[in-house]
């Protein structure tokens, strides 16, 4: 806290400009004007104070717009962006994407912070939904947060958002997430024809069910082996050799350096034997010739 | 983090000059502007000098025309040269820098110096 004390005869600020650099805080703090500087925020930004200085500059901010700052102060925050807390933001009504992406800017190349993740989470509310330009933007600089969000938080995020989503944004989604995104990925590349929509929605396919799987055979894809092994396992199961292979094609090789691992090991145990050496791979672990095989979990369905 | 090292204080007779250096380490991609602060005995730290990452530089009216701050961003070095010292000049001389990753900013430890 600085100590309130009269402004030197000479030095009360007029504007807002590079000379308030050389104050010391407690100048800063008598001389400069709340209301001056929140007309002026633009200008503080373009001035390199230190963080102590910073500190000076918030605390007549804070006492200028208790209830929390007005979006034409927030917009021009810069550097003092990092000095607010979650609680400071959380005052905040932010609803103008130039904003968002001008605090964003801040913190560019670092993690997200509790700061801006709380940022993200007024914003998003106060839009009701995660439209597309929101989407752009925020995986423009965080890669990851789509996959951060919960299923409930993806389920408002519209189709036609999906567009804005590149295979390095759902690197760390996990299968609860993607079950969530598959769908309104389908549907946002409906018109889309075999080849170009298989581009698209690849990196969706850790959610798609086992009918979208055997379709998808069906059409000459040629699945890679990464995509593959992100698929779920409940729905790689039902599978059958021949359809795995269609899916797979040239790719189908690398079963074998997979063969240990899931879904493949779960699949390979699932198919006989027989059909398996038809791919000419040596894999091994399939149902032995002559053994039938119950369905249990069918049986107690009709029961 | 930053940590940082200054250099090259002493004791200089009235109107001779000391080069100051301050070498940066640790997190130093971070760095964003860098500064030249000092404290007389009895008297307020006050800031002598900045030279941002982009170089624009500026320092104080009681300085002017006869300190430079400069930056060599390969060495993660800071310099001040002072020129035409002053008896007033006598502080010990602190570096500190903002970065763009944590909002506190990291200082020296100073180093002393004594114009006769």
């Known amino acids: 806290e600085v100590e309130k004390t009269a402004c030197p005869s000479g030095k009360k600020a007029r504007e807002i400009d590079e000379s308030l650099i050389f104050y010391k805080k407690w100048e800063l703090e008598a001389c400069v004007d709340a209301a001056l500087l929140a007309t002026q925020m633009d200008r503080v930004n373009a001035i390199p104070f230190t963080y102590e200085q910073l500190d000076v500059l918030k605390h007549k901010l804070d006492e200028l717009y208790p209830q929390g700052y007005p979006e034409s102060v927030i917009q021009h925050l810069g550097y003092l962006f990092l000095k607010m807390s979650p609680e400071d933001i959380r005052k905040w009504n932010v609803t103008s994407l130039e904003t968002l992406k001008a605090l964003l800017e801040v913190n560019k190349g670092h993690e997200m912070s509790p700061q801006v993740a709380t940022l993200i989470d007024r914003f998003v509310k106060g839009r009701g939904q995660l439209d597309k330009d929101t989407l752009d933007t925020l995986t423009a600089f965080y890669p990851g947060y789509l996959c951060s969000l919960s299923p409930e938080e993806l389920s408002s995020v519209p189709p036609s958002s999906i567009w804005a989503v590149r295979p390095q944004d759902l690197d760390t989604c996990d299968p609860r997430q993607l079950d969530v995104l598959y769908p309104k990925a389908r549907l946002a590349f409906q018109n889309m024809n075999g080849s170009e929509y298989f581009v698209k929605i690849q990196s969706f396919l850790g959610g798609a069910p086992t009918e979208d799987l055997k379709a998808l055979s069906q059409q000459n894809v040629s699945m890679d082996l990464a995509t593959f092994m992100k698929l779920r396992t409940d729905a790689v199961l039902p599978l059958t050799v021949a359809e795995v292979q269609k899916l797979l094609g040239p790719h189908v090789e690398g079963l074998k350096a997979e063969e240990r691992h899931r879904p493949v090991r779960d699949w390979i145990l699932r198919q006989r034997q027989d059909d398996l050496d038809t791919l000419g791979l040596g894999l091994q672990g399939g149902i032995p010739n002559g053994y039938l095989v119950l369905d249990l979990s069918m049986q107690e369905a009709l029961s | 983090e930053v940590q940082l090292v200054e250099s090259g204080g002493g004791l200089v007779q009235a109107g001779g000059s000391l080069r100051l250096s301050c070498v940066a380490s640790?997190?130093?991609?971070?760095?964003?502007?860098m500064y030249w602060h000092r404290q007389a005995p009895g008297n307020e730290r006050e800031l002598v000098a900045y030279v941002t990452s982009r170089g624009t530089s500026n320092v104080a009216d009681s300085v002017k025309g006869r300190f430079t701050i400069s930056r060599d961003n390969s060495k993660n070095t800071l310099y001040l040269q002072m020129n035409s010292l002053r008896a007033e000049d006598t502080a010990v001389y602190y570096c500190?820098?903002?970065?763009?990753?944590?909002?506190?900013?990291?200082w020296g430890q100073g180093t002393l110096v004594t114009v006769s």
């Open positions: 500190s820098v903002r970065t763009t990753s944590y909002p506190v900013d990291f």
């Open positions: 640790g997190r130093t991609s971070t760095i964003d502007t």
